[in-house]
C-alpha cells in the first residue's frame, strides 16, 4: 500500500453543540431567517453546526499542525500547510484548492521555509499615500505625472502553466493572474489549472469579496488552540481511482479503509446516490426541531 498505516494527530468526536449538547450533524450552518437551513450547501468545507444562542452557527473546528509545508491556494494565497488552507476555506465558506506545493510565488517574502517553521501571517501589503490604497502587490509611483498604482510583477521567468481565472480569462501562468489582478486593482482568483473551456460559466466563476484582498505571505497562521480539528485521513492510493463517483476518496488511518466524502447532493458508500433531503432546523429555546 502507498498509505502509511498509522499516524495522524486528529481526534474523533461528534459535532459538538453549545450548552453541553451534542448535535448529530456534519456540515450545518446558519441562515439569517426564521427557518434556518442546515444542509451540506450552507456549511461546507469541514464546518460543523454549533448552537449559538437561539440559533446555529457554522463552526470551523480545525486544530492544525504547524509544520511549515507551504501550499499555493487557488485564491493566490500561500498557506503554511494544507490544513490552514482547508481551515481558511471553511472560515470564508469558499472553495480553495491546492494548485501547487510550495509558495504561490518566490518573491512573496515568506521564503522557502529553509530553517523556518512558522508562517508570518503578515497582513495585506498596501501602500497608502496620495495614490490611495494600492492593492495586490501594486506600489505607488509618486513621481509619475499621472500618480497611480504601478505593478512591478515580473512574470518573464515563469514556465508555461496555463490556468483559468475567475474573470473567465485564460492565463499562461499563475503569475500572470497576479499581474492582471495588480494592474486592474481587483481580485482575480485562479479557478482551475488549464485553459478556460466553454463549460466554464464566467457568472459562476465569480469574484472574491473586496474585503479579502490578496495577501502575499503565509495565511491563517493563527493561534491553534481555538479549535479542535477532527482529522484522521489522507489521500487514497492510486489503485482506488474512481472509488468515489461523486466525491473525494479518503484513506482513514484508524480503520485502514477508504471512504468517500460526497459532494453536495450525493450520498451512499461511493457517493453514487442522489440525496434530495434537506434538513431545516427551527431554532427554539428547548430543542432543535426537524421540519
Amino acid at each position: 500500500s502507498n498509505q502509511p498505516p498509522g499516524g495522524g494527530g486528529g481526534s474523533g468526536g461528534d459535532c459538538p453543540g453549545g450548552k453541553g449538547k451534542s448535535i448529530n450533524c456534519s456540515e450545518l450552518n446558519v441562515r439569517e431567517s426564521d427557518v434556518r437551513v442546515c444542509d451540506e450547501s450552507s456549511c461546507k468545507y469541514g464546518g460543523v453546526c454549533k448552537e449559538d444562542g437561539d440559533g446555529l452557527k457554522c463552526a470551523c473546528q480545525f486544530q492544525c499542525h504547524t509544520n511549515y509545508i507551504p501550499v499555493c491556494g487557488s485564491n493566490g494565497d500561500t498557506y503554511q500547510n494544507e490544513c490552514f488552507l482547508r481551515r481558511a476555506a471553511c472560515k470564508h465558506q469558499k472553495e480553495i484548492t491546492v494548485i501547487a506545493r510550495g509558495p504561490c510565488y518566490s518573491d512573496n517574502g515568506s521564503g522557502s521555509g529553509e530553517g523556518e517553521e512558522e508562517g508570518s501571517g503578515a497582513e495585506v501589503h498596501r501602500k497608502h499615500s496620495k495614490c490611495g490604497p494600492c492593492k495586490y502587490k501594486a506600489e505607488c509611483d509618486e513621481d509619475a505625472e499621472n500618480v497611480g498604482c504601478v505593478c512591478n510583477i515580473d512574470c518573464s521567468g515563469y514556465s508555461f502553466n496555463p490556468v483559468c481565472a475567475s474573470d473567465g480569462s485564460s492565463y499562461n501562468n499563475p503569475c500572470f493572474v497576479r499581474e492582471a489582478s495588480c494592474i486592474k486593482q481587483e481580485q482575480i482568483d485562479i479557478r482551475h489549472l488549464g485553459h478556460c473551456t466553454d463549460t466554464d460559466d464566467t457568472s459562476l466563476l465569480g469574484k472574491k469579496d473586496d474585503g479579502l484582498q490578496y495577501r502575499p505571505d503565509v495565511k491563517d497562521a493563527s493561534d491553534q488552540r481555538e479549535d479542535v480539528y477532527i482529522g484522521n485521513h489522507m489521500p487514497c492510493p492510486e489503485n482506488l481511482n474512481g472509488y468515489c463517483i461523486h466525491g473525494k476518496c479518503e484513506f482513514i488511518y484508524s480503520t485502514q479503509k477508504a471512504s468517500c466524502r460526497c459532494e453536495s447532493g450525493y450520498t451512499g458508500q461511493h457517493c453514487e446516490k442522489t440525496d434530495f433531503s434537506i434538513l431545516y432546523v427551527v431554532p427554539s429555546r428547548q430543542k432543535l426541531t426537524h421540519v
Partner: antibody
Framework: QVQLVESGGGVVQPGRSLRLSCAAS????????MHWVRQAPGKGLEWVAV????????FYIDSVKGRFIISRDNSKNTLYLQMNSLRAEDTAVYYC??????????????WGQGTLVTVSS | DIQMTQSPSSLSASVGDRVTITCRAS??????LAWYQQKPGKVPKLLIY???TLQSGVPSRFSGSGSGTDFTLTISSLQPEDVATYYC?????????FGQGTKLEIK
C-alpha cells in the same frame, strides 16, 4: 512493498564530508516528507532533518544547521544528506524515514535499515 | 524548541505486570505524539500515533493516552518479547523531537 535503503556511510576524518543516500521504492515518493534520524552508539534517537515533497521546505536540528544539507531527487526517488565539516559527535547510525503531512500529520511508519557514519581521526 | 522528557529512563518488571511509561512535552503539542519500540539491533517500530491510536498490527496490550503536555504508554500485561527501548516523539512541528528513551527489561 515499501522499502527505504540507505547507503554512503563509512569512516571519515573530522572536518571532511560525506554524502548519504536513501533509495525509496514501493510508494509514491512525492507524496511523503522524507526525514533523517540518527542514533549514536548506545544512545537514543535524534531527529536530524526533513525535506518536504517538492524540496521547497526543509528544516534541520540546530546542531547540524549550516553543515548538513538535506535534498531529494523526485525523479530518482532518492533522498540525500550532504554532511560537511563532520565532527566526532556526528558518529551515528543514520536512518531515513518517511512521513505524510498534509491536512493532518503522521509520524514515521517506515524506516530504512540505517547506515553507519564514523567520524574519527 | 519543545523538549520531550521520558520517565523512567529504565525499568524492570515481571511478565504479566502492567507497565507505564510517561512522556512530558515542555509545551502543548495537542495529540501529535507517537510512541516507538526499538529492540536491540533493530529499526524503531511505530506503536502508537495521535497519542492513543494503535498502529495496525500492534498487539492490543499496548495503549496510549494523554493530550497537551502529558502522555502515557501502557503495556497491560508485559510479555518477554516486549523487552526494548521505548521512545516518544512529537510531530506537530519541526524539530520532530524524541524523548531520551525508556529501557524496559524483564525481572
Amino acid at each position: 512493498q515499501v522499502q527505504l535503503v540507505e547507503s554512503g556511510g563509512g569512516v571519515v576524518q573530522p572536518g571532511r564530508s560525506l554524502r548519504l543516500s536513501c533509495a525509496a521504492s514501493g510508494f509514491t515518493f512525492t507524496s511523503y516528507g522524507m526525514h533523517w534520524v540518527r542514533q549514536a552508539p548506545g544512545k537514543g534517537l535524534e531527529w536530524v532533518a526533513v525535506v518536504w515533497y517538492e524540496g521547497n521546505s526543509k528544516f534541520y536540528i540546530d546542531s547540524v544547521k549550516g553543515r548538513f544539507i538535506i535534498s531529494r531527487d523526485n525523479s530518482k526517488n532518492t533522498l540525500y544528506l550532504q554532511m560537511n565539516s563532520l565532527r566526532a559527535e556526528d558518529t551515528a547510525v543514520y536512518y531515513c524515514a518517511r512521513a505524510y503531512c498534509g491536512d493532518d500529520c503522521y509520524p514515521f511508519d517506515y524506516w530504512g535499515q540505517g547506515t553507519l557514519v564514523t567520524v574519527s581521526s | 524548541d519543545i523538549q520531550m522528557t521520558q520517565s523512567p529512563s529504565s525499568l524492570s518488571a515481571s511478565v504479566g505486570d502492567r507497565v507505564t511509561i510517561t512522556c512530558r512535552a515542555s509545551q502543548g503539542i495537542s495529540n501529535y505524539l507517537a510512541w516507538y519500540q526499538q529492540k536491540p539491533g533493530k529499526v524503531p517500530k511505530l506503536l502508537i500515533y495521535a497519542a492513543s491510536t494503535l498502529q495496525s498490527g500492534v498487539p492490543s496490550r499496548f495503549s496510549g493516552s494523554g493530550s497537551g503536555t502529558d502522555f502515557t504508554l501502557t503495556i497491560s500485561s508485559l510479555q518477554p518479547e516486549d523487552v526494548a527501548t521505548y521512545y516518544c516523539q512529537k510531530y506537530n512541528s519541526a524539530p520532530w523531537t524524541f524523548g531520551q528513551g525508556t529501557k524496559l527489561e524483564i525481572k
